[in-house]
């Protein structure tokens, strides 16, 4: 599927104090939809500010947004899925600025869950697992997956490993032996849809077993 | 009103390249992505990819790979398809038209014709 | 490539008759109830014209006698009274994988 440009890239708002970022959760709850926007500048003062939606809609020209914290909030079963919307920074009426946004480019899948490590000890590795809620929906189905890991010791050396299933087989022999791993794992769109990262799921940790010597043979 | 406008008509040789242009007005430039579409005389619509003028970013068709180049000026609010290595069954209107969704056409050029003749 | 298969090639139809063209791809261009299938007319000498875009949705200033329907891989361009003015060829256009593919038309004549 070509798509242009990187992920979930997002257009320059006209009015650089008010530039603003959206993701879209398609069925997040049911079969209602998600959209959620915010200011880059954490700074911005938003008293009085809203956002409004309009176009590429059902049965509506525009929607507001809901008010959250700093965080602007639609849910909703109104989203055609199909063309760009304008999004808009309103005040009092007059807009300070405005997005057109394909909604099905900016999407955010949930995080997975359920992450745990199998050790087979007649296989020699580890068997990964976790699951998304994202099997039992029907737009975004499709996902990629960045599972990392890393030796708890190692603050900044993940190693990552892509895969579209939610299994993984991690060779013992690629692992330091009696070390302390830390594992996690993030989805993105893989068909059609296009977006971001999910937010990480929450960490695992297992600890490697301690190299087996057969008999006879001496420890370094 | 929203207008894509072309440039004209063009007669080349087999072997040498054409470069057509395409200019938008009455949008804002970066809202809508920019795709070519060709038409051999009689024939049906063929895609041949696309451009984000947000980003530069781009879209081809597998098949014309290697040959064709889609490029934008944000200046002038203008992209530009250039077609290599041109042979006879290139003979065609070439058709700018902007994506309004993902990805279908609601706003079309004039069109080009680009005749392939020795 | 996903191969679009319009039906019939030619129509001929009374005026103020109903005209209907089918569109059958090589594999789904759907994802639930988003259809990735749109319809154009063309006149000759003129570029193609937006009718409709995800399989049923009418473009702004289209006549409403225009409607579109269907999913999966079978897709349907009615038009429910036909004018002199809509003698034109139609096509069809799937735009769920690149490259993005038309039909080979359909052209539409007043009987």
């Known amino acids: 599927e070509s798509g242009y440009a990187q992920n979930g890239d997002l257009e320059d708002a006209e009015l650089d104090d008010y530039s603003f970022s959206c993701y879209s959760q398609l069925e997040v709850n049911g079969s209602q939809h998600s959209l959620t926007c915010a200011f880059e500048d954490p700074d911005v003062n938003t008293t009085n500010l809203e956002f409004e939606i309009c176009g590429a809609l059902v049965e509506v020209k525009c929607l507001s947004f809901r008010k959250l914290q700093e965080i602007y909030f639609i849910e909703t079963k109104k989203f055609l899925l199909i063309g760009k919307s304008n999004i808009c920074v309103k005040v009092g009426g007059k807009s300070l600025t405005c997005k057109k946004i394909d909604l099905t480019t900016i999407v955010k899948p949930e995080a997975p869950f359920d992450l745990s490590v199998i050790y087979r000890e007649g296989a020699n590795d580890f068997v990964v697992t976790f699951n998304t809620s994202h099997l039992q929906k029907k737009y975004v189905k499709v996902l990629m997956h960045d599972v990392a890991y890393r030796q708890e010791k190692d603050e900044n050396k993940w190693m990552h490993v892509n895969l579209s299933s939610t299994k993984l087989t991690l060779l013992q022999r690629n692992l330091q032996p009696e070390a302390m791993y830390e594992i996690k794992v993030r989805s993105i769109p893989d068909h059609y849809f296009k977006g971001f990262w999910s937010e990480w799921s929450p960490s695992y940790y297992f600890r490697t077993p301690e190299i087996n010597n057969s008999p006879g043979e001496m420890d370094p | 009103q929203v207008q894509l406008v072309q440039s004209g008509a063009e007669v080349k040789k087999p072997g040498a390249s054409v470069k057509v242009s395409c200019k938008a007005s009455?949008?804002?430039?970066?809202?809508?992505?920019l795709h070519w579409v060709r038409q051999a005389p009689g024939q049906g619509l063929e895609w041949m990819g696309g451009?984000?003028?947000?980003?530069?970013?781009?879209a081809y068709n597998q098949k014309f790979k290697g040959r064709v180049t889609m490029t934008r000026d944000t200046s002038t609010s203008t992209v530009y398809m250039e077609l290599s290595s041109l042979r006879s069954e290139d003979t065609a209107v070439y058709y700018c038209?902007?994506?309004?969704?993902?990805?279908?056409?609601?706003?079309w050029g004039q069109g080009t014709t680009v005749t392939v003749s020795s | 490539d996903i191969v679009m298969t319009q039906s019939p090639d030619s129509l001929a139809v009374s005026l103020g008759e109903r005209a209907t063209i089918n569109c059958r791809t090589s594999?789904?261009?759907?994802?639930?109830?988003?259809?990735?299938m749109h319809w154009y007319q063309q006149k000759p000498g003129q570029p193609p014209k937006l009718l409709i875009y995800?399989?049923?949705n009418l473009e702004s200033g289209v006549p409403d006698r225009f409607s579109g329907s269907g999913s999966g891989t079978d897709f349907t361009l009615t038009i429910s009274s036909l004018q002199a003015e809509d003698v034109a060829v139609y096509y069809c256009?799937?735009?769920?994988?690149?490259?993005?593919?038309f039909g080979g038309g359909t052209k539409v004549e007043i009987k």
């Open positions: 038209a902007r994506s309004g969704g993902r990805w279908y056409f609601d706003v």
């Open positions: 009455g949008y804002r430039f970066t809202d809508y992505e």
């Open positions: 594999e789904s261009v759907s994802i639930h109830l988003l259809h990735l």
């Open positions: 995800g399989a049923s």
């Open positions: 451009i984000d003028p947000k980003t530069g970013g781009t």
């Open positions: 256009q799937q735009s769920i994988k690149d490259p993005y593919t």
